[in-house]
Interface confidence: low
């Protein structure tokens, strides 16, 4: 622990004026792990004048930094770059004549206490006035600065010509883009002092490059990835006083992909789970043993979770029987393409028969089965069960459903008793 300081596993405090410290305290290599330090308190250190760029970087867990009644004159711009956990800073009664917002802009500070410093009245500290104005009244501090006459004036009264917040205005083409294409965003910034322009693209995956010239900037995004759909892109104008930003959301259109399709699981209903990605939202169509599956209130598609361009859902089946065993294929399509994926589903064996070894059926009943006019139609009043007899389906003028005679008496079927008069015997 440095001379004139005391250290614990989480705290460093340097309050003894003699002999005092001349540099920001650093721990010896084999002492406490600096990452565990959450609080540093420095007081009465008249010879501590500077916080250098690398003085504080080792204390990545630092939450509270207090330097009071000391000689602090200068803080390097990047001094707190690595200290993202900092919440409370107290620089009361030091020798600071200026302090830039660049020191703190990346921090989520709860407190920044700066009373008792001999600030010079200039545009450099106008950001403090702006900060004070946004705070609720109990949180405000009595900050003063020395004017040209070396008179103390309240920061609240500070008026500096040509010293105001900047503005940013984003001119972007309609940011609905097809995957793989490119787009250029244009941004104009203004203000006095002249702001710098930068782009905040967050975790954008797509390749992007920017060009900036004074008050104009462009961001070129090339070979746009579908992973970037829904992401926000911001143009930021920043000067001494503060910053402004203008944002747009990126929408990427791309062909569907069925990323997940699995065998049925049984909960309250039976469910064939799937995940589909695509934008615009893909239309979904199921096929059963190669034929279109006519959805009804007994067999229907349910989307349970929508995550922007990803859809998680089920083909939900109410009390399926052995007659619903077979191959289920999901097709997803939009104007950019389509995808199909298939699974084999086995809900149960035939009553009294080992389905695995004897898949032959007794005499069956047929029901006409016509294609719905609308994909995903769940209003169809019919409640047919898809056929499991693939060979028999192959050359039919009308697609037909199969129902085993043995099953007609059961109550837990997808066919209700009222519908039985619709069936004709073959």
């Amino acid at each position: 622990c440095p001379t004139s300081c005391k250290c614990s596993s989480a705290r460093i405090w340097c309050t003894e004026p003699s002999p005092g410290i001349v540099a920001f305290p650093r721990l010896e290599p084999n002492s406490v792990d600096p990452e565990n330090i959450t609080e540093i308190l420095i007081a009465n250190q008249k010879r501590l004048e500077i916080i250098n760029e690398d003085d504080v970087e080792a204390y990545v867990g630092l939450r509270n930094l207090t330097i009071v009644d000391s000689g602090l004159k200068f803080v390097a711009y990047k001094a707190f770059l690595k200290n993202s956990n900092l919440r409370h800073i107290n620089f009361t009664r030091n020798k600071l004549t200026s302090l830039s917002r660049r020191h703190f802009r990346h921090l989520d500070l709860s407190d920044l206490i700066l009373t008792g410093n001999p600030f010079t009245c200039s545009c450099d500290i106008m950001w403090l006035k702006t900060l004070q104005e946004t705070k609720s009244s109990p949180d405000t501090q009595d900050l003063y600065c020395l004017n040209e006459s070396s008179k103390n004036m309240p920061l609240a009264n500070l008026q500096i010509p040509n010293c105001g917040l900047p503005s940013a205005r984003l001119a972007a083409p309609n940011l609905t883009v097809e995957e793989g294409k490119s787009v250029t965003l244009s941004c104009s910034v203004g203000g006095d002092p002249l702001p710098t322009l930068y782009w905040d693209v967050g975790n954008l995956v797509s390749k992007h490059m920017n060009e900036t010239s004074h008050t104009q900037g462009s961001l070129r995004i090339t070979n746009i990835s579908s992973d970037d759909s829904g992401k926000q892109i911001s143009c930021v104008a920043e000067n001494l006083v503060g910053e402004d930003q203008d944002s747009v959301n990126l929408t990427v259109h791309f062909a569907p992909t069925i990323t997940f399709l699995e065998s049925p699981t049984s909960d309250h209903h039976w469910c064939i789970p799937f995940t589909v990605r695509g934008n615009p939202k893909p239309a979904l169509q199921w096929f059963y043993n190669g034929a279109i599956l006519n959805e009804s209130k007994y067999i229907c598609t349910k989307i349970h979770v929508t995550n922007h361009t990803e859809y998680h859902g089920c083909l939900q089946l109410d009390n399926p029987t052995h007659m619903n065993n077979g191959d289920y294929t999901l097709m997803a399509k939009n104007e950019y393409g389509k995808d199909e994926r298939q699974i084999s589903a086995h809900f149960m064996g035939r009553p009294g028969v080992d389905y695995e070894t004897n898949p032959n059926y007794p005499e069956v009943l047929y029901e006409d089965w016509t294609t719905p006019t609308d994909i995903g139609d769940t209003t169809n009043k019919s409640n047919e069960i898809p056929s499991t007899d693939v060979a028999d389906q192959s050359n039919r003028e009308h697609e037909q459903k199969l129902i085993s005679e043995e099953d007609l008496g059961g109550e837990q079927k997808l066919i209700s008793e009222e519908d039985l008069h619709h069936h004709h015997h073959h």
Epitope: A171, M209, E211
Partner: antibody
Framework: EVQLQQSGPELVKPGASVKISCKAS????????MNWVKQSHGKSLEWIGD????????SYNQKFKGKATLTVDKSSSTAYMELRSLTSEDSAVYYC????????????WGQGTTLTVSS | DIVMSQSPSSLAVSAGEKVTMSCKSS????????????LAWYQQKPGQSPKLLIY???TRESGVPDRFTGSGSGTDFTLTISSVQAEDLAVYYC????????FGSGTQLEIK
């Protein structure tokens, strides 16, 4: 004065490749996108692609992917377009054009390079 | 891809006359927030390279005579020459820069 000086006319055989140059003067090459445009005889203009001279990043018209390759030499302030596997369909005048105001419009054009593909 | 259609393909007028030519895009070129249309007009005189006349659909490029006026928004655009001069003999192209770049087929202006 901004100028884009293109290389001279080319007569090449089918199947060959050709590299057309465009030397920029009067401005800094890296300040603007460089675009390439094709004009077949008596026909309209077709955008081929553009290049960011700072980092060589390119965008292409789908039609010209695999046909055209855009590059720059910053040291000589020159942009290049190479055309490969040439056929008579590639016979045309090719222009380089500076992309101004974020490359939304082309404010300065080269004088054009005439390419003739003939056996 | 955005398709640009120009009409007429050619027209002949006498010097001093007013002339208009049309350009239509297959989708809107308007940025709703900035109210800017991503459309430009170019002039190509015989044996010369194209020259930028109008950008953002209606902004005249510096040095372009004020007899050239661009108008329109969304998908329908017009180039007007208020009083045609002999030196205006050229082909006029519109171009969109909304999604990549596409040129129209051109309008040939002849002087009677």
């Amino acid at each position: 004065e901004v100028q884009l000086q293109q290389s001279g006319p080319e007569l090449v055989k089918p199947g060959a490749s050709v590299k057309i140059s465009c030397k920029a003067s009067g401005y800094t090459l890296t300040d603007y996108y460089m675009n390439w445009v094709k004009q077949s005889h008596g026909k309209s203009l077709e955008w081929i692609g553009d290049i960011n001279p700072n980092n060589g990043g390119t965008s292409y018209n789908q039609k010209f992917k695999g046909k055209a390759t855009l590059t720059v030499d910053k040291s000589s302030s020159t942009a290049y377009m190479e055309l490969r596997s040439l056929t008579s369909e590639d016979s045309a005048v090719y222009y380089c054009a500076r992309g101004a105001y974020y490359s939304n419009y082309f404010d300065y054009w080269g004088q054009g390079t005439t390419l003739t593909v003939s056996s | 891809d955005i398709v640009m259609s120009q009409s007429p393909s050619s027209l002949a007028v006498s010097a001093g006359e007013k002339v208009t030519m049309s350009c239509k895009s297959s989708q809107s070129l308007l940025n709703s927030r900035t109210r800017k249309n991503y459309l430009a007009w170019y002039q190509q005189k015989p044996g010369q390279s194209p020259k930028l006349l109008i950008y953002w659909a209606s902004t005249r490029e510096s040095g372009v005579p004020d007899r050239f006026t661009g108008s329109g928004s969304g998908t329908d655009f017009t180039l007007t020459i208020s009083s045609v001069q002999a030196e205006d003999l050229a082909v006029y192209y519109c171009k969109q820069s909304y999604i990549l770049f596409t040129f129209g087929s051109g309008t040939q202006l002849e002087i009677k």
